[in-house]
């Protein structure tokens, strides 16, 4: 025998109080699949949250975060404070990255600078709190007569023919 509730489409619920007929989800609720015996409460996007997509009878609301905060967790279940580049969020708030670490985003943790020597390379540009070091050619490549980097051709001055 087929369950009469299986005929109830998304946006409705199978109402036991009304002889299992399909009733529309009440305001502030939804059912995203058919055959539901209850509708789920719509999520509210208030306070630090903003509504990205309104709740409908067939789908839940979707939230994002107010400026200065970013989403964390499945479906933006939390809003975490942004920090500046060169900082990370701790339990005491935003703190500058320690020497030797950097963060080039407004979220996440400070990460150690790349250790160029592990790849047999030298430091071309020093790291900062906001930026990783830039590794250059290996020290061996920089020895006289062993350059593997083709130097740029000298710029010609206008009005002069090549020698």
């Amino acid at each position: 025998l087929q369950d009469p509730c299986s005929n109830c489409p998304a946006g409705t619920f199978c109402d036991n109080n009304r002889n299992q007929i399909c009733s529309p989800c009440p305001p502030n609720s939804f059912s995203s699949a058919g055959g539901q015996r209850t509708c789920d409460i719509c999520r509210q996007c208030k306070g630090v949250f903003r509504t990205r997509k309104e709740c409908s009878s067939t789908s839940n609301a979707e939230c994002d975060c107010t400026p200065g905060f970013h989403c964390l967790g499945a479906g933006c279940s939390m809003c975490e404070q942004d920090c500046k580049q060169g900082q990370e969020l701790t339990k005491k708030g935003c703190k500058d990255c320690c020497f030797g670490t950097f963060n080039d985003q407004k979220r996440g943790i400070c990460r150690p600078w790349t250790n160029c020597s592990l790849d047999g390379k030298s430091v071309l540009v020093n790291g900062t709190k906001e930026r990783d070091v830039v590794c250059g050619p290996s020290p061996a490549d920089l020895s006289p007569g062993a350059s593997s980097v083709t130097p740029p051709a000298p710029a010609r001055e206008p009005g002069h023919s090549p020698q």
Partner: antibody, heavy 118, light 110 residues
Framework: QVQLQESGPGLVKPSETLSLTCTVS????????WSWIRQPPGKGLEWIGY???????NYNPSLKSRVNISVDTSQNQFSLKLNSLTAADTAVYYC????????????WGQGTTVTVSS | QSVLTQPPSASGTPGQRVTISCSGS????????VNWYQQFPGTAPKLLIY???QRPSGVPDRFSGSKSGTSASLAISGLQSEDEADYYC???????????FGGGTKLTVL
């Protein structure tokens, strides 16, 4: 289960600053709003303000110039500071957890009575 | 002056059904779910109904909530003497970006 406990002075002089702390036990302070509500003797409930665990705050416009709410997630505590007190600030002060999905205040502290008097 | 309007008092006899109304505006009840709280003398309020009509676990099904437009109501059927308490409605207010309360209704069981 989660429990809230208010602490602070019961008697404060006019023009001084009230400092109250709410300690959250039995659960995390993360992913909820934490509110302060007060109730003057024989009167109704008045929302003072809230703080989200990550630092977002909002205050009742009628009190905004005098109030500050802060959170210390490492101690699982949040605090209320209300300055320039007058006798009209005499009330029972409650801290409460506000759910961040449906926004009901589902856990309350037992309340602390604050009297403003010289 | 509370943002949400409730009658200051209501009464009923044991077994009766009583309703408490709560009136607001488009920025609060009209656009947001309503919560109800029960408060006994000398104790903290307790969440009784959330999201218009949902009961937290442990709340008897004698308590029910509903909302229409910018008004909401709390109904208590089969009134009991232990229901004598103050009842407050509350809703988020979009213009404040925070909650607003009704002034409270003192329910007396005669």
């Amino acid at each position: 289960q989660v429990q809230l406990q208010e602490s602070g002075p019961g008697l404060v002089k006019p023009s001084e600053t009230l400092s109250l702390t709410c300690t959250v036990s039995g659960g995390s302070i993360s992913s909820y709003y934490w509110s302060w509500i007060r109730q003057p003797p024989g009167k109704g409930l008045e929302w003072i303000g809230y703080i989200y665990y990550s630092g977002y705050t909002n205050y009742n416009p009628s009190l905004k110039s005098r109030v500050n709410i802060s959170v210390d997630t490492s101690q699982n505590q949040f605090s209320l500071k209300l300055n320039s007190l007058t006798a009209a600030d005499t009330a029972v002060y409650y801290c409460a957890r506000t759910h961040s999905y449906y926004y009901g205040m589902d856990v309350w502290g037992q309340g602390t009575t604050v009297t403003v008097s010289s | 002056q509370s943002v949400l309007t409730q009658p200051p008092s209501a009464s009923g006899t044991p077994g009766q059904r009583v309703t408490i109304s709560c009136s607001g505006s488009s920025s609060n009840i009209g656009n947001n779910p309503v919560n109800w709280y029960q408060q006994f003398p000398g104790t903290a309020p307790k969440l009784l109904i959330y999201s218009n009509n949902q009961r937290p676990s442990g709340v008897p099904d004698r308590f029910s909530g509903s909302k229409s437009g910018t008004s909401a109501s709390l109904a208590i059927s089969g009134l009991q003497s232990e229901d004598e308490a103050d009842y407050y409605c509350e809703a988020w207010d979009d213009s404040l970006n925070g909650p607003v309360f009704g002034g409270g209704t003192k329910l007396t069981v005669l």
